[in-house]
């Protein structure tokens, strides 16, 4: 969370940004809020990126002004125009790429004053893991798969029954490069699993952490997955 202040005459305006993460190959959002101003035509929003000449996006007088926009952002950016009056200056970015990572500045000017705040935008790939029972193996084993990660994550297994146990000796993890030659498929196999136990497969890099849980009993298999972005907010 970064809060910036600005002075215009005697007026301070607070601009707040949140460290954000973008999943490459999807649309992303760079979050920025400011003190609301009901006079939409008096609001100017400028997004800038460190090391880039020209603007990422500009919104003023109630509409986009893309005349100074840098080529790498052409056709890819939007503010949430209907939310600007309530203080939302967040930027939507289409088809996030690794090269979009960096330091961005959200600059705001309103009738109350002006201010800005920086935002660190991280880009990578993250996806939900899916755990299945691998019946092909000679002994009962679990297979945890996640289709897209970057940078290369760490993978760890945990068990509800054997809390604190180290499963590195009885698991095997591989990373297979996907066709676009950036992201990788993560596959981890845990051997010698026991029935009536809940196992967790945890995949983590510096952008996201995902966990897949599986409970295998004699009568059923229960699964649950969750994903959280790290250092955001």
């Amino acid at each position: 969370l970064i809060i910036g202040f600005g002075i215009s005459g005697k007026h301070f305006i607070t601009v707040t940004t949140f460290t954000s993460a973008g999943n490459i190959g999807e649309d992303g959002t760079l979050s920025c809020t400011f003190e609301p101003d009901i006079k939409l035509n008096g609001i100017v929003i400028q997004w800038l990126k460190e090391g880039i000449k020209g603007l990422v996006h500009e919104f003023k007088e109630g509409k986009d002004d893309l005349s100074q926009q840098h080529e790498m952002f052409r056709g890819r950016t939007a503010v949430f125009a209907d939310q600007v009056v309530v203080g939302n200056a967040s930027l939507r970015l289409k088809n996030v790429q690794l090269t979009d990572a960096g330091t961005y500045t959200c600059y705001i000017r309103t009738s109350k004053g002006k201010g800005n705040a920086n935002l660190e935008y991280k880009t990578g790939a993250f996806s939900m893991p899916e755990i299945n029972v691998d019946y092909n193996a000679s002994s009962e084993s679990l297979r945890c798969e996640a289709p897209r990660w970057f940078p290369q994550p760490t993978v760890a297994w945990a068990s509800q029954v054997d809390q604190g146990a180290n499963f590195s000796e009885v698991s095997n993890t591989s990373f297979e490069l996907n066709s676009e030659n950036v992201t990788m498929k993560v596959v981890s196999v845990l051997y010698n699993v026991t029935i009536n136990n809940t196992y967790s497969c945890m995949i983590e890099n510096d952008i996201a952490k995902a966990t897949g849980d599986i409970k295998v009993t004699d009568s059923e298999v229960k699964r649950r997955s969750q994903l959280q972005l790290l250092n955001s907010g």
């Epitope: 996006h57 509409k63 986009d64 893309l66 056709g75 939007a78 289409k94 088809n95």
Partner: antibody, heavy 116, light 109 residues
């Protein structure tokens, strides 16, 4: 040369299934947002489905639960699996690439006719 | 859902004249996400303008786009015989993800 070539269209009875294919050349399908857009006879363009670079998909309400977009990265090919077809699905189906700058590459289209 | 309404439905003009086609959105659309296409009978659509005002590769400079917010315009400064076709505006980014206008037919007077 950047190109998209659709195939798989034809005459099908209501309730039937069909799979359309779109072979891409000159670029990598998985790096782009790939779409299916259709055009009923004498009508305008209607977006059907998208598959993002990430592999996530989205579809128009009119086809949700019936049509599934997918891709085979090794074949650099886009697909549209169409189930429970209705007369109102009759159209020319185009695949189209969105390279951030709008739908900049289109296939020639393949015709789907749903009729008994 | 954002609805794009194009006007006029049909525009009858002669070669050499100026054509002005309008696209109005039911709510604000980002200029970045507004595009124009040309479609001739029996052919696939062709991207003309993206980002409301940027010409796509290979598009002649007689085609220009303008506008922001809810009102967008495609202008053809001097009509050539090959310009007579149907023109569609399209937006990206809301639900449904892509929305097209109903089209404007540009015909020879």
């Amino acid at each position: 040369e950047v190109q998209l070539v659709e195939s798989g269209g034809g005459l099908i009875q209501p309730g039937g299934s069909l799979r359309l294919s779109c072979a891409a050349s000159g670029f990598i399908v998985s790096r782009n947002y790939m779409n299916w857009v259709r055009q009923a006879p004498g009508k305008g363009l209607e977006w059907v489905s998208v598959i993002y670079g990430s592999g996530r998909t989205d579809s128009a309400d009119s086809v949700k639960g019936r049509f599934t977009i997918s891709r085979d990265n090794s074949k650099n090919t886009l697909y549209l699996q169409m189930n429970s077809l209705r007369a109102e699905d009759t159209a020319v189906y185009y695949c189209a690439r969105d390279a951030d700058y709008g739908l900049d590459v289109w296939g020639q289209g393949t015709t789907v006719t749903v009729s008994s | 859902e954002i609805v794009l309404t194009q006007s006029p439905g049909t525009l009858s003009l002669s070669p050499g004249e100026r054509a002005t086609l309008s696209c109005r959105a039911s709510q604000s659309v980002s200029s970045s996400y507004l595009a124009w296409y040309q479609q001739k009978p029996g052919q696939a659509p062709r991207l003309l303008i993206y980002g409301a005002s940027s010409r796509a590769t290979g598009i002649p400079d007689r085609f220009s786009g303008s506008g922001s917010g809810t009102d967008f315009t495609l202008t053809i400064s001097r009509l050539e015989p090959e310009d007579f076709a149907v023109y569609y505006c399209q937006q990206y980014g809301s639900s449904p993800l892509y929305t097209f206008g109903q089209g404007t037919k540009l015909e020879i007077k």
